[in-house]
Interface confidence: medium
């Protein structure tokens, strides 16, 4: 289980149309459910229940986004429509270039994602927890324009991390 180095870039627009970017660095783990690859895309926060629906009108995004899913406590969803792996697959089918799961409230999901699949996804499936997950969700919950950059080695240049 390799470390995934995740940079989350929040874009703040200026009157001139330029963007100031604030980069927050955090770490997660590549799970065996997906590939150990770099990926980058605009963050789309996905509701775990939103991944249950399988109709066209739920295919809401263009290709190449990074799905962020905060998993609920298992007792809040005792009969999930899909396994965690199934949810990752559904997100990739809908055009996600990577999926990041916040497993803080559902640590059992780590084992599910690492059980190893005969047919792993060709895109990275990363999980984060604890302080890293809090940092990530603090940015995502702002519902502002943000991108995630996932790398399997540390960023070459030390980033000036801006803690949200």
């Amino acid at each position: 289980k390799e470390t995934a180095f995740v940079e989350v870039v929040l874009f703040e627009s200026s009157p001139s149309g330029d963007y100031t970017t604030y980069t927050t660095g955090l770490t997660g783990r590549f799970s065996r459910a997906g590939a150990t690859l770099s990926a980058e895309g605009e963050i789309v926060q996905m509701h775990p229940l939103g991944l249950c629906n399988n109709n066209d009108e739920e295919d809401l995004y263009e290709y190449g986004w990074v799905g962020v899913v905060k998993l609920e406590q298992p007792e809040l969803d005792p009969k999930p429509c899909l396994t965690v792996l199934g949810k990752a697959k559904r997100a990739v089918q809908r055009g996600a270039t990577a999926v990041i799961f916040d497993v803080s409230e559902n640590p059992e999901a780590i084992d599910q994602l690492n059980q190893g699949s005969e047919d792993p996804l060709k895109r990275p499936v990363v999980y984060v927890k604890g302080a890293d997950a809090i940092k990530l969700m603090n940015i995502v919950n702002k519902q502002k324009v943000a991108r995630a950059r996932i790398q399997h080695r540390p960023p070459r240049q030390p980033t000036e991390y801006f803690d949200m």
Epitope: E12, S14, M46, H47, L49, E57, Y61, Q143, K144, V145
Partner: antibody, heavy 121, light 109 residues
């Protein structure tokens, strides 16, 4: 068919109360956050408030002009949303719409047909 | 708190391109949604997340958002596009949804 249907509007005196209902069908109501939006006669849209899904804590939030006077609640067993309006003012006169929010996007993809509330003496 | 400003009215000839603007402080940092409303009807979502089009919305509707301005563009405007259009966003500082004042699009002729 995915549908929201409001009811309960009518004429009420200033200072009075009214409860609006919004009946949902054609989708899993409990999974979604639902909002109330109003539109005064000849005016634009104004957001009133929201209630999140139970899995998101069922949190309610309100716009400043109605905070403390309006209360949003939901009964997932009946697929119904409610808006309890107290201490009504003439400026609350509007068509009230309930609207479903796309997960986390706060964009409203399904709207009801609206119900008119008139506050007048 | 963010405030959204729209022109009260825009006129366009059939077949031409209509552009409706929505301005707000650093609006390009936010996701903007657009609604169409015809008289006596409920609003309809035509663009969400700056540029995404829900299923069933014609391809002539498109959106962009940069700097302080979001724009709804209707190319090859048709008579049925005559309606009020509202921009909206979510203000994460107040946890409120905010609507612009609305723009009346008139398709001439």
């Amino acid at each position: 068919e995915v549908q929201l249907v409001e009811s309960g509007g009518g004429l009420v005196k200033p200072g009075g109360s009214l409860r609006l209902s919004c009946a949902a069908s054609g989708f899993t109501f409990s999974d979604y956050g639902i909002h109330w939006v109003r539109q005064a006669p000849g005016k634009g849209l104004e957001w009133v408030g929201r209630i999140k899904s139970k899995t998101d804590g069922g949190i309610t939030e309100y716009a400043a002009p109605v905070k403390g006077r309006f209360t949003i609640s939901r009964d997932d067993s009946k697929n119904t949303l409610y808006l309890q309006m107290n201490s009504l003012k003439t400026e609350d006169t509007a068509v009230y719409y309930c609207a479903r929010a796309i997960y986390y996007l706060e964009a409203f993809d399904v709207w009801g047909q609206g119900t008119l509330v008139t506050v007048s003496s | 708190d963010i405030e959204l400003t729209q022109p009260p009215s825009v006129s366009v000839s059939p077949g031409q391109t209509a552009s409706i603007t929505c301005s707000g402080d650093s609006l390009g940092s936010y996701y903007v949604h657009w609604y169409q409303q015809k008289p006596g009807q409920a609003p309809v979502l035509v663009i969400y997340r700056n540029k995404q089009r829900p299923s069933g919305i014609p391809e002539r509707f498109s959106g962009s958002n940069s700097g302080n301005t979001a724009t709804l563009t209707i190319s090859g405007t048709q008579a049925e596009d005559d309606a009020d259009y509202y921009c909206a966003t979510y203000d994460s500082s107040s946890w409120w949804n905010v609507f612009g004042g609305g723009t009346k699009l008139t398709v001439l002729g």
